[in-house]
C-alpha cells in the first residue's frame, strides 16, 4: 500500500492510473466504502463523504488515464486509506496528515520558551527534527521545547516529520521580541546633550504597549521613574515625565530619549521596560550614562567621572602632545600646580579613548578657561 504524507491546511494529490490512456469509469472511496468522487461519463460526481466540498480532480488528466483525488485544506482526520476503483482494479493509498504548531503564538519575548506541538493521526509514530535559524537541531516526538529563546532564534525554523520512511517538511516563522542590544553605555562630558536610543530587533505591523524608564543614579540611594509612555501602532506618547531631569521623547520608533544635559547627578544606570499588548512579560534594555568633568580649583586640576565604569578603564590627565602626567584605574585623578596649556582628561579602554574633556590652564595670574 502506497503511503502519502500531507500537511494540515495544505493540498494533497493522490494518484490513480489506468493502463488505458483514456478517460474511463473510475471512483474514489474511503476505508468505509463511502464514495468521495468519480465520473459519470466525462462529468465529475461527488459522493456523500465529509470531504465533499474539499475533494477535487483534474479533468485534463483523465484523457491520459490519470484520475487524481485532490484534497484541499487537509485536516488531521482526513488521514485514512483511500481506494481508487478503475478497470476492475483497486489502488489503495494511505494518507497520513500531520500538523505542526507553535505554542500560543509565534511572537515570543526573549528568554521565553518555544514549544512546538505535532498533531498526528492515531496509530502513527512519527519522529520530528527541527533546525533553528542559527543551525541548532532539536529532536522529539509529539512536542519539542526550546527554553530561553535568544535573538538569534528569530527566523524560519525548519521541521521534518518522518513516518514510514517518508518525510514532510514544515516551516515555522518565529519572531523573538527583543531590543537590538541588551545593554548600552553612553559617555558624555558634563553639560552635553545625551541621546538614548532603544532600537527593536523585530518589525511588526502594529505595535502597541506601554513602557517606563527607571533610573538609578550613582549618587542616589534609590531608583526613580524618569518617564512612562504609551505605544500605539508605532506612535509614542508620553504619559508622565519627571521634572528633573526633563526628558524628551521621540514620537516615532525607534524609542528615542533626549536628556538636555549630562550632569554628575544623572550618571548611573537605567532600565527601559516595554510591555507589549497581549504578551506576558516585558522587554528590557539596560542603559548606562557616564559623565566626565574636568575642573581647576586654585592649584589643583581635577578630572572626575561618574557612572558605571569598569575597573579596567583608565582615567588620565595629560598636557596636549605630552605624556600622561597621571593615569589611574580610578574615577578621579588630579595634578597639583599644572603647567599652563591645554590639558586633556581621557577615559580609555585598552588604549581606545571613550571620553575626552579639554581644559585650558592659564598662567598663574589668570583664571582657567574651559573650552
Amino acid at each position: 500500500k502506497k503511503v502519502v504524507l500531507g500537511k494540515k491546511g495544505d493540498t494533497v494529490e493522490l494518484t490513480c492510473t489506468a493502463s488505458q490512456k483514456k478517460s474511463i469509469q473510475f471512483h474514489w472511496k474511503n476505508s468505509n466504502q463511502i464514495k468521495i468522487l468519480g465520473n459519470q461519463g466525462s462529468f465529475l460526481t461527488k459522493g456523500p463523504s465529509k470531504l465533499n466540498d474539499r475533494a477535487d480532480s483534474r479533468r485534463s488528466l483523465w484523457d491520459q488515464g490519470n484520475f487524481p483525488l485532490i484534497i484541499k485544506n487537509l485536516k488531521i482526520e482526513d488521514s485514512d486509506t483511500y481506494i481508487c476503483e478503475v478497470e476492475d482494479q483497486k489502488e489503495e493509498v494511505q494518507l497520513l496528515v500531520f500538523g505542526l504548531t507553535a505554542n500560543s503564538d509565534t511572537h515570543l519575548l526573549q528568554g521565553q520558551s518555544l514549544t512546538l506541538t505535532l498533531e498526528s493521526p492515531p496509530g502513527s509514530s512519527p519522529s520530528v527534527q527541527c533546525r533553528s535559524p542559527r543551525g541548532k537541531n532539536i529532536q522529539g516526538g509529539k512536542t519539542l521545547s526550546v527554553s530561553q529563546l535568544e535573538l538569534q532564534d528569530s527566523g524560519t525554523w525548519t521541521c521534518t516529520v518522518l513516518q514510514n520512511q517518508k518525510k514532510v517538511e514544515f516551516k515555522i516563522d518565529i519572531v523573538v521580541l527583543a531590543f537590538q542590544k541588551a545593554s548600552s553605555i553612553v559617555y558624555k562630558k558634563e553639560g552635553e546633550q545625551v541621546e538614548f536610543s532603544f532600537p527593536l530587533a523585530f518589525t511588526v505591523e502594529k505595535l502597541t504597549g506601554s513602557g517606563e524608564l527607571w533610573w538609578q543614579a550613582e549618587r542616589a540611594s534609590s531608583s526613580k521613574s524618569w518617564i512612562t509612555f504609551d505605544l500605539k501602532n508605532k506612535e509614542v506618547s508620553v504619559k508622565r515625565v519627571t521634572q528633573d531631569p526633563k526628558l524628551q521623547m521621540g514620537k516615532k520608533l525607534p524609542l528615542h530619549l533626549t536628556l538636555p544635559q549630562a550632569l554628575p547627578q544623572y550618571a548611573g544606570s537605567g532600565n527601559l521596560t516595554l510591555a507589549l499588548e497581549a504578551k506576558t512579560g516585558k522587554l528590557h534594555q539596560e542603559v548606562n550614562l557616564v559623565v566626565m568633568r574636568a575642573t581647576q580649583l586654585q592649584k589643583n586640576l581635577t578630572c572626575e567621572v561618574w557612572g558605571p565604569t569598569s575597573p579596567k578603564l583608565m582615567l588620565s590627565l595629560k598636557l596636549e602632545n605630552k605624556e600622561a602626567k597621571v593615569s589611574k584605574r580610578e574615577k578621579a585623578v588630579w595634578v597639583l600646580n599644572p603647567e599652563a596649556g591645554m590639558w586633556q582628561c581621557l577615559l580609555s579602554d585598552s588604549g581606545q579613548v571613550l571620553l575626552e574633556s579639554n581644559i585650558k590652564v592659564l598662567p598663574t595670574w589668570s583664571t582657567p578657561v574651559q573650552p
Epitope: K22, S23, Q40, G41, S42, L44, T45, R59, S60
Partner: antibody, heavy 118, light 107 residues
Framework: QVQLVQSGAEVKKPGSSVKVSCKAS????????IHWVRQAPGQGLEWMGM????????TYAQKFQGRVTITADESTSTAYMELSSLRSEDTAVYYC???????????WGQGTLVTVSS | DIQMTQSPSSLSASVGDRVTITCRAS??????LNWYQQKPGKAPKLLIY???TLQSGVPSRFSGSGSGTDFTLTISSLQPEDFATYYC?????????FGQGTKLEIK
Amino acid sequence: QVQLVQSGAEVKKPGSSVKVSCKASGYTFITSYIHWVRQAPGQGLEWMGMINPSGGTTTYAQKFQGRVTITADESTSTAYMELSSLRSEDTAVYYCARDSSGYPIDYWGQGTLVTVSS
Amino acid sequence: DIQMTQSPSSLSASVGDRVTITCRASHHISDFLNWYQQKPGKAPKLLIYAASTLQSGVPSRFSGSGSGTDFTLTISSLQPEDFATYYCQQSYSSPYTFGQGTKLEIK
C-alpha cells in the same frame, strides 16, 4: 457514424405530459451517458439531467426533480425523457446528447420542439 | 448551484479579428469547463473541453484557458463561419449549468 435521432415535434396542453425519444446508432449504446438539454425560444441552454444506460442510474437538475423522468431501453438503444405537469414556460427545443466519457456531449440529436399551449 | 456568467453577452467583430470571450464560475470548478458553438436552428457543437483541450476536428484558431473560476475562449483570427453563439458549461457539479451565451455578430 454516431447518430442520435429524436422524435417529432409535439403540441401539448398545460398540465399534461410529454415523452420525447432519442434513438442512438453508430456506437455501443451502454458505453455512453445520455444527457437532456433544453432551449426555450431565443434563450440559452439548460441542462435537465442524464442517464447511464448501463444500469439506468440517473441524475437530475434540482429544478426538474419530480417532474422529469429519464429512462433508457438497451434493447432498442433508445433513451426517453418524460416531462409532466407541463406549463407554457416548458415550451422549448429538447435535445438529447451523448457523453462518451472522453468527450463531454460530443454528439447531439436534432432537437424536438415541444409547444405547451392551451 | 454553480452559476456560470459569460461576458460579453454580445460582440461585434470583423473577419480576421482576435476575439476573447470570458466565463466565470460562482465556485471553484477546477478545469471542468466546456465550450460549445451554436448556430441558429442547429444543435450545439463541442469546441473545447477540460478548459483547454481542443476537440478533434475543431480548427486550431480556437483555444481555451483558465482554471478554478475564470476561463477564456479565444478565436485568434475570425472566419466567416465563426459567427454564432458560444456557450460555456461546467461539468464539475450537478446541475451541470451553462453560461447565458455570447452572440458573436459581424461588424
